[in-house]
């Protein structure tokens, strides 16, 4: 009896695995092996297949051969018993464009109400993603185990922190890899499950905001309590997409270690240009609180970020006020060459309710003040950036008093 | 397979300088940092710091800042530790720890070991 | 510097015995905390981070618990092979700290 050649041959590329899967065309005949051959792009001889040579099953594994992942390559497949079938050939493939990303590998730390996240590719020295090592990103579906309702983050790194989590609670998450450059979207990891801790005894701080006085950086965040030291750290920024470099930690600002106020002060020639982290914790000498939220610190944007020069034309009812570029030392304007919108607040003189103004555009009118008062404006300047939240310090107050009556016009 | 080779047992004399070696094997070894732990007679284990085996920079634990130092001979794969001015005090056996997290340091703890090399001060 | 407690030296054991080791932080370290074995003459092992993670190759006897300040190694299924000092070893903040260590000792 003739064999019959195998059919529907399916190939899988799973990070460097290479699996194939057949149908056998003949379920009656027994003791039937399987053998493949190979040809790669511009060659005219067939190599054997290692690995999936007089194959019983329905399935073999090639991964040992070194394949240029790039390079298209065409299979074949025969049935053998005393004699062979005809060869199958199965469609010519490249197996870089065939292959799926394969689960990551998931780390989880936890705080009371965070936690840290640290992935890096399920197969370590992957020859498949070799040139896109530090081009991965990752997303991922994580829930409170007792509710199940699950909330995305997509497009993190290889390190990630998740905030504003209830303490003493079991989280779960999944993590997939993607490679956006080559539209590709990878398998989710197996789910991994963790327990905050009980709540700390110190919160940690807060609302960390970076400024640029004169030549200096000034770091201010808010805290609870009062007799606290703070200590501040730095890390470059593109440190979170390399999951493969162990040498970084983060690093104190020495000027900035053990300070007894929310703020501390440090030259900006502390940081080259570039994209850092910071992050800031309090302790009160027995304990200490867990790092705060990280924040996101462009010297570029904050150097020139310059609290808005304005002036003030000043009506019975209304002040009209005309933002500029703001001034360097040398009173040459700064080109603040991205867009920023304008946060312009106002107070009567005698009294410390202030109200606010948020504009884009630089002329501005104040409306509804009394006529014959004197009203204070300060003004300050934010990137329209969302990943780059940044802000100016507030402009120094400027104070004028309104027209008399019915100068509107 | 990976491996931290340390330097022999010494005797030395206080005030007298010692240096030990650890020598890695069987991974890129500019890719983690290298811990030093001290653990005198009897006692438990002490941090002593780190190398960044990279660029070089030190990390001193306060409890060792001023006689000890370490440097690396990258083409050798080889960390060192030299102490100073030896003192009673410093008798113990010093490790080398290779990381073992996969990812940036603020979470370090030690996936693989030298043997230990021995410093024993006697006048 | 975060101090790390192992209140008991020295734990008396038999083979086949259920063994719990306790380690407790002076404040919350999350669980970033390790479990090291060290038999004499020899270096320490890693047997267990992040609280509760194995390590590789560690048998299956050896557990981690715990979170916030206080942690627990267990050893399951006591083995004569196990019969060593155990050290705990926080590393949430700089200085990296261990406990002092627990002997495991036959009764």
């Known amino acids: 009896k003739n064999l019959k050649s195998p059919q529907k041959v399916e190939v899988d590329i799973i990070d460097d695995n290479f699996i194939l899967r057949w149908n056998r065309s003949d379920e009656s005949v027994g003791n039937v092996t399987f053998s493949f051959d190979y040809q790669k792009t511009g060659m005219d001889n067939w190599i054997k297949l290692s690995g999936c040579q007089n194959i019983t099953s329905t399935k073999c594994n090639f991964s040992s051969l070194k394949l240029n992942v790039y390079e298209e390559i065409k299979l074949r497949i025969r049935a053998e018993k005393e004699n062979t079938s005809s060869w199958y050939e199965v469609d010519s493939f490249t197996p870089f464009r065939k292959a799926q990303i394969g689960p990551p590998e998931v780390h989880l730390e936890a705080e009371d109400k965070a936690i840290v996240i640290h992935i890096s590719p399920g197969t370590k020295d992957s020859v498949m993603w070799a040139l896109d090592g530090l081009s991965f990103t990752y997303s991922l579906v994580i829930w409170k185990n007792s509710s199940g309702v699950e909330e995305r983050i997509e497009n993190i790194y290889s390190r990630h922190k998740i905030y504003k989590l209830s303490p003493e609670t079991t989280y779960c998450l999944k993590v997939k890899a993607a490679l956006l450059t080559s539209w590709k979207i990878g398998v989710y990891s197996p789910v991994h499950c963790i327990k905050t801790t009980v709540e700390n005894e110190l919160p940690p701080p807060e609302n960390i905001e970076v400024s640029v006085q004169n030549q200096n950086y000034v770091l201010k965040w808010d805290y609870t309590y009062a007799n606290m030291t703070f200590q501040v750290q730095w890390l470059h920024a593109f440190l979170k997409r390399n999951p493969g470099n162990h040498l970084y930690k983060w690093k104190q600002i020495p000027d900035c270690e053990n300070v007894k106020t929310t703020q501390c002060v440090f030259p900006q020639n502390v940081f080259q240009k570039g994209i850092y982290l910071l992050r800031v914790q309090a302790s009160d000498g027995n304990n200490t609180s867990f790092w705060s939220e990280e924040i996101k610190f462009d010297t570029e944007i904050q150097a020139f970020l310059l609290p808005p020069v304005f002036n003030i034309r000043s009506l019975s009812d209304s002040f009209h006020i005309y933002i500029g570029a703001p001034k360097q030392s040398g009173n040459t304007p700064v080109i603040q060459d991205y867009p920023l919108i304008y946060e312009i607040i106002f107070w009567e003189n005698t009294s410390n309710a202030e109200r606010k103004i948020i504009e884009k555009k630089t002329d501005v009118t104040v409306p509804n003040l009394k006529p014959l008062t004197v009203y204070c404006v300060k003004a300050r300047a934010h990137t329209m950036d969302e990943k780059l939240n940044k802000s100016s310090v507030f402009s120094d107050a400027v104070c004028e008093k309104t027209k008399p009556g019915n100068t509107s016009k | 397979q990976i491996q931290l080779v340390q330097s022999g047992p010494e005797l030395k004399k206080p005030g007298e300088t010692v240096k030990i070696s650890c020598k890695a094997s069987?991974?890129?070894?500019?890719?983690?940092?290298m811990n030093w732990v001290k653990q005198a007679p009897g006692k438990g284990l002490k941090w002593m710091g780190w190398i960044n085996t990279y660029t070089g920079e030190p990390t001193y634990s306060d409890d060792f800042k001023g006689r000890f130092a370490f440097s690396l001979e990258t083409s050798a794969s080889t960390a060192n530790l030299q102490i100073n001015n030896l003192k009673d005090e410093d008798a113990a056996t010093y490790f080398c720890?290779?990381?073992?997290?996969?990812?940036?340091?603020?979470?370090?703890?030690?996936?693989?070991w030298g043997a230990g090399t021995t410093v024993t001060v006697s006048s | 510097d975060i101090v790390m407690t192992q209140s008991q030296k020295f734990m008396s054991t038999s083979v086949g015995d259920r063994v719990s080791i306790t380690c407790k932080a002076s404040?919350?370290?999350?669980?970033?905390v390790a479990w090291y074995q060290e038999k004499p003459g020899q270096s320490p092992k890693l047997l267990i981070y992040s609280a509760s993670n194995r390590y590789t190759g560690v048998p299956d006897r050896f557990t981690g618990s715990g979170s916030g300040t206080a942690f627990t190694l267990t050893i399951s299924n006591m083995q004569s092979e196990d019969l060593a000092d155990y050290f705990c070893q926080q590393y949430y903040n700089y200085p990296l700290t261990f406990g002092a260590g627990t002997k495991l000792e036959v009764k």
């Open positions: 404040q919350n370290v999350g669980t970033a």
């Open positions: 069987g991974y890129t070894f500019t890719n983690y940092g």
């Open positions: 720890a290779r990381e073992g997290a996969i990812y940036y340091g603020d979470y370090v703890y030690f996936g693989v």
